[in-house]
């Protein structure tokens, strides 16, 4: 049965450049190994932002990526991307692959539009 991946359509990053959003898939397959990839789409180009493999024992992911973190619980991944700046505003897609045991399944969400607004620099104070 095909998997459907859902993610919110819009997220606003915090003033510190942090955006968090869930990525869920259904139906929930009995899977030992789930690979989650965050992709950024600009025009017709897709680039990988970060990727990780979750297992029953390893539910904290993206340890190799300084700007991504995530936790996995059943069929839901809570993703956080940090270090974002206004130029990083764009559509971020969540791809889920059920890697093991076979058969392999893959699904992709429709994307989360992340808006990033650079904070105004603090004005110099006169003492």
């Amino acid at each position: 049965e095909a998997i459907q991946v859902t993610q919110p359509s819009v997220v606003l990053a915090s003033s510190h450049g942090v955006a968090s959003f869930p990525c869920e898939y259904s139906p929930s397959h009995n899977t030992d190994e789930v690979r989650v990839t965050v992709l950024r789409q600009t025009n017709d180009q897709m680039t990988e932002v970060c990727a990780t493999t979750f297992t029953e024992k390893n539910t904290v992911g993206f340890l190799d990526y300084p700007f991504c973190s995530g936790t996995f619980n059943e069929s839901r991944v809570n993703l956080t991307i940090q270090g974002l700046r206004a130029v990083d505003t764009g559509l971020y897609l969540c791809k889920v692959e059920l890697m093991y045991p076979p058969p392999y399944f893959v699904g992709m969400g429709n994307g989360t539009q992340i808006y990033v607004i650079d904070p105004e620099p603090c004005p110099d104070s006169d003492f």
Epitope: E1, A2, I3, Q4, V5, E33, L39, M46, E48, K95, M99, Y100, P102, P103, Y104, F105, V106, G107, M108
Partner: antibody, heavy 119, light 108 residues
Framework: QVQLVESGGGVVQPGRSLRLSCAAS????????MHWVRQAPGKGLEWVAV????????YYVDSVKGRFTISRDNSNNTLYLQMNSLRAEDTAVYYC????????????WGQGTLVTVSS | EIVLTQSPGTLSLSPGEGATLSCRAS???????LAWYQQKPGQAPRLLIY???SRATGIPDRFSGSGSGTDFTLTISRLEPEDFAVYYC?????????FGPGTKVDIK
């Protein structure tokens, strides 16, 4: 430019073994999933097997499970297909193909190598 | 496994005409993970369309793909002499990654 060159095909008797190789060049081999696809004479395409970029995950079509083994050597940019207990219905041109990075469709193919299983 | 059915089996047309090729899946798969390939005699297949509607690099814009769910279409707006070939659809949403049986486009 991307190049995939298969070798190892030939005529073999039923029940015997054969190992196909696919030499890859022109791209970062260790970043891509690699596939074998076959085509029996005058017939359509049949996907056979895939091995993920790191070699950890492998999947096969049911008709070859337990007989064929896909493997790769990322240090030598080479893909392999070990074929055991060959049957007449395995006769085909075998292509190696690169799985595109964002989905397992095949953006580059080799020229194919013919395997004939006959007594 | 997902079974793909292509129709018609053969399409006899003249250069300059348009062609519509159909691919139907036995069940839906995720995210329109469907590709189209062209194969000429004695050659390896060539990727035309992926993601149901995205043209591969270097593919002319007379080729277009559409569809979702279980029904997909490859359209060739005006057939050029080099377009007469066999066309295969392939799903890559779940293993095994199956192909359709092909549609042969030949010259009338």
């Amino acid at each position: 430019q991307v190049q995939l060159v298969e070798s190892g095909g030939g005529v073999v008797q039923p029940g015997r073994s054969l190992r196909l190789s696919c030499a890859a060049s022109g791209f970062t081999f260790s970043s891509f999933g690699m596939h074998w696809v076959r085509q029996a004479p005058g017939k359509g395409l049949e996907w056979v097997a895939v091995i993920w970029y790191d070699g950890r995950n492998k999947y096969y079509v049911d008709s070859v499970k337990g007989r064929f083994t896909i493997s790769r050597d990322n240090s030598n940019n080479t893909l392999y297909l070990q074929m055991n207990s060959l049957r007449a219905e395995d006769t085909a041109v075998y292509y190696c193909a690169r799985g595109e990075f964002f989905g397992e469709f095949f953006d580059y193919w080799g020229q194919g190598t013919l395997v004939t299983v006959s007594s | 496994e997902i079974v793909l059915t292509q129709s018609p089996g053969t399409l006899s047309l003249s250069p300059g005409e348009g062609a519509t090729l159909s691919c139907r899946a036995s069940q839906s798969f995720s995210s329109n993970y469907l590709a189209w390939y062209q194969q000429k005699p004695g050659q390896a297949p060539r990727l035309l369309i992926y993601g149901a509607s995205s043209r591969a690099t270097g593919i002319p814009d007379r080729f277009s793909g559409s569809g979702s769910g279980t029904d997909f279409t490859l359209t060739i707006s005006r057939l050029e002499p080099e377009d007469f070939a066999v066309y295969y659809c392939q799903q890559y949403g779940t293993s095994p990654f199956t192909f359709g049986p092909g549609t042969k486009v030949d010259i009338k």
